[in-house]
């Protein structure tokens, strides 16, 4: 699952929101990495034009540095996950009426997208910011 | 819903200790940090530490370092919340509230805690 | 620890009004800051999340600015539920810390 290496993110739609020259994760359970991860958040970026204002640039920035981990390199370069607290923020304040309309429609299966990535990263299950804080990235 | 529902108010005297209790119910317990936070009569909020009920671990304000332990219960999602060697200052209302800065904001209705001789 | 400072500890004002609390961090908190209002013998309630971040159910003359050490709670056109104690959290590290409190009565 966390197979892969660090390289210098090259693709456009995380441009904006990921640091210049970041090194991310690119994971080896795709055949090509760097297309599919971009596919992946292209398709969901796309979603993200419906959402408010205030969730947007949260959500994406979620979305860009879940898909695109910050990664720190070493013998086994290794993908550093979001900070919990980060996440929960985006899911409960910046978003949380998408968050609701979304999990709602995904529960009664009217729903499948990729902006139901977003969900992927489970908040409880993240390192924290207070207590693991170099286990995971600040946004 | 998501509730938070705390344990009566509690008479206590000097140099003795206290249990406050605080019921979570309508998520899911342990994927969210519990704070303790007091406020004695007539005074501002004051931060006394944090539990996270998944694995138990604790945060302190180190001002009752020594004097406080949070603990918690996953079979009936409650967390508790001990002051040992209590003195007339500990008089406040304790309030746990769920994640406080982070998440949506919800808090216990608060536990009057008196301490007199 | 952070020291997180309020002011003015009270203020009266009217009405109408337009009313800025002010919240000094000890240190830089990025913008991990959270406003509180409080009535007499209610549980307090979150307005403000991370600087500026509208709670949802808040009015929007309640809004909040600033970044690193600096942050200001504004109410715009002062209502007469508005009178209570507000209060600033930093959420950046362990200990949290509240601001003192701002005690806003009416004039």
């Known amino acids: 699952d966390n197979k892969g290496y660090c390289a210098q993110y090259r693709g456009e739609v995380c441009n904006a929101v990921l640091a210049k020259d970041a090194l991310v994760f690119l994971n080896t359970s795709y055949a090509d990495p760097e297309e599919a991860q971009e596919l992946l958040v292209h398709t969901a970026w796309n979603e993200l034009k419906v959402v408010s204002p205030v969730c947007r640039p949260a959500a994406e920035a979620l979305l860009c540095n879940h898909i695109f981990q910050e990664c720190s390199p070493g013998v086994v370069p290794t993908p550093i996950p979001i900070c919990r607290e980060y996440c929960l923020a985006v899911k409960e304040l910046f978003c949380a009426k998408e968050w609701l309309v979304m999990e709602e429609k995904t529960h009664r299966g009217l729903y499948r997208s990729e902006m139901h990535l977003l969900s992927v990263p489970e908040c409880s299950k993240l390192p924290s910011m207070h207590w693991d804080p170099t286990a995971c990235a600040r946004l | 819903q998501v509730q938070l529902v705390q344990s009566g108010a509690e008479e206590k005297k000097p140099g003795a200790s206290v249990k406050v209790s605080c019921k979570a119910s309508?998520?899911?317990?342990?994927?969210?940090?519990m704070h303790w936070v007091r406020q004695a009569p007539g005074q501002g909020l004051e931060w006394m530490g944090i539990?996270?009920?998944?694995?138990?671990?604790?945060s302190y304000a180190q001002k009752f370092q020594g004097r406080v332990t949070m603990t918690r219960d996953t079979s009936t999602s409650t967390v508790y919340m001990e002051l040992s060697s209590l003195r007339s200052e500990d008089t406040a209302v304790y309030y746990c509230?769920?994640?406080?800065?982070?998440?949506?904001?919800?808090w216990g209705q608060g536990t009057l805690v008196t301490v007199s001789s | 620890d952070i020291q997180m400072t309020q002011s003015p500890s009270a203020m009266s004002a009217s009405i109408g009004d337009r009313v800025t609390i002010t919240c000094r961090a000890s240190q830089d908190i990025s913008n991990y800051l959270a406003w509180f209002q409080q009535k007499p013998g209610k549980v307090p309630k979150r307005l403000i999340y991370v600087a500026s971040g509208l709670q949802s159910g808040v009015p929007s003359r309640f809004s909040g600015s600033g970044s690193g050490t600096e942050f200001t709670l504004t109410i715009s056109s002062l209502q007469p539920e508005d009178f209570a104690t507000y209060y600033c959290l930093q959420h950046n590290s362990y200990p949290f810390t509240f601001g003192q409190g701002t005690k806003l009565e009416i004039k």
């Open positions: 509230a769920r994640e406080l800065g982070w998440g949506s904001d919800y």
């Open positions: 539990i996270n009920p998944s694995g138990g671990n604790t």
């Open positions: 309508g998520y899911t317990f342990t994927n969210y940090y």
